[in-house]
């Protein structure tokens, strides 16, 4: 159950999808990826205030316990709820091949 | 691909399963849950240093970009990789029922 999408901290401050441009060198991929030379990495960044985009029951519990014991229990964290596939042309044991990665680019975010 | 399980920060400092004892009042459940009166909540807590229990390619990217742009990209976060089911005896519109929740107690943790 995804809870509220209204961010009480102000526009853009809560958990949402961001795009970060990164080179192969930035990613440490220069020695095994041929293409693309640059990746638009979509990732989940932002705060997870009470019940904001709570992914499930566990996230709701975490929010309650964080309120009670903030030094022991961290607030929920903004992570991918789903991914978009990405194709890389990469070096492999048997030459160069096209590989699809299903867990590389975040598509949607939630708090957990 | 789950990466290294060795914590460079010292024993117990990295992402792992913790148990937090919580009453129904703590969880805000006192008005709709009859049993159990207390829950041993298992949750994922701890740091996610470079490549520690990296859940997938996205987590590896996040580590690389956090190292480069720590103010923009947060470090990976310790979250459940899987859950244990939990049965609650709860009040419903038509009386009392037994409900199984599949997303309440963390079973295993990883960094993402």
């Amino acid at each position: 159950a995804r809870n509220g999408d209204h961010c009480p901290l102000g526009p853009g401050r809560c958990c949402r999808l961001h795009t970060v441009r990164a080179s192969l060198e930035d990613l440490g991929w220069a020695d095994w990826v041929l293409s693309p030379r640059e990746v638009q990495v979509t990732m989940c960044i932002g705060a997870c205030p009470s019940q904001f985009r709570a992914a499930n029951m566990h996230a709701q519990i975490k929010t309650s316990l964080h309120r009670l014991k903030p030094d022991t229990v961290p607030a929920p964290c903004c992570v991918p709820a789903s991914y978009n596939p990405m194709v890389l042309i990469q070096k492999t044991d048997t030459g160069v091949s096209l590989q699809t990665y299903d867990d590389l680019l975040a598509k949607d975010c939630h708090c957990i | 691909a789950r990466n290294g399980d060795h914590c460079p920060l010292g024993p117990g400092r990295c992402c792992r399963l913790h148990t937090v004892r919580a009453s129904l009042e703590d969880l805000g459940w006192a008005d709709w849950v009859l049993s159990p009166r207390e829950v041993q909540v298992t949750m994922c807590i701890g740091a996610c240093p470079s490549q520690f229990r990296a859940a997938n390619m996205h987590a590896q990217i996040k580590t690389s970009l956090h190292r480069l742009k720590p103010d923009t990209v947060p470090a990976p976060c310790c979250v459940p990789a899987s859950y244990n089911p939990m049965v609650l005896i709860q009040k419903t519109d038509t009386g009392v029922s037994l409900q199984t929740y599949d997303d309440l107690l963390a079973k295993d943790c990883h960094c993402i």
Epitope: S35, I89, K91, T94, G95, V96, S97 | -
Partner: antibody, heavy 112, light 107 residues
Amino acid sequence: QVQLQQSGAELVKPGASVKLSCKASGYTFTNYDINWVRQRPEQGLEWIGWIFPGDGSTKYNEKFKDKATLTTDTSSSTAYMQLIRLTSEDSAVYFCARILYWGQGTTLTVSS
Amino acid sequence: DNKMTQSPSSMYASLGERVTITCKASQDINSYLSWFQQKPGKSPKTLIYRANKLVDGVPSRFSGSGSGQDYSLTISSLEYEDMGIYHCLQYDEFPYTFGGGTKLEIK
């Protein structure tokens, strides 16, 4: 099974051009690279160049960059190598290959 | 370019003998090295890839080893059908480069 079927022997006159073909089967043509290799009589193997059918990118041995042009036709899963301004020095057997698989070779004879 | 120096350029060996051929790269090739066997008038046949992985269907008497710049192909017990020319290829960086070849003949 993977097969690379090359076109038949060619006899051409000096100064002419020729286009050799390599038809791939048994795998997804656009997902793997193809190399072209030359073997002159009683000599070793020389790497001419590389093409990735997925995006058409190419790499050439500096020695052959003004001699060879690599292309592909993805609709027929065929790789081509065009050789221009032929001289007797270009008489050789030409192979298309992946790291694990080799075509049977095409014999090119340049003679007036 | 990464130059591949293969040795010996030719050799004679007896049936049942252990044979080793080496390839040295001028720079580290991260184990991106393959070995081929070629018989007269035939196309090369890949034996080993990524320095030490045996191609399916290739007899287990063939093995590859090495890392960094130095690699070797070993035939544990030479058989008659093993005579031919052996080539190495580095496919770590473009341009890919071949060794000069080793002609193996039976004594």
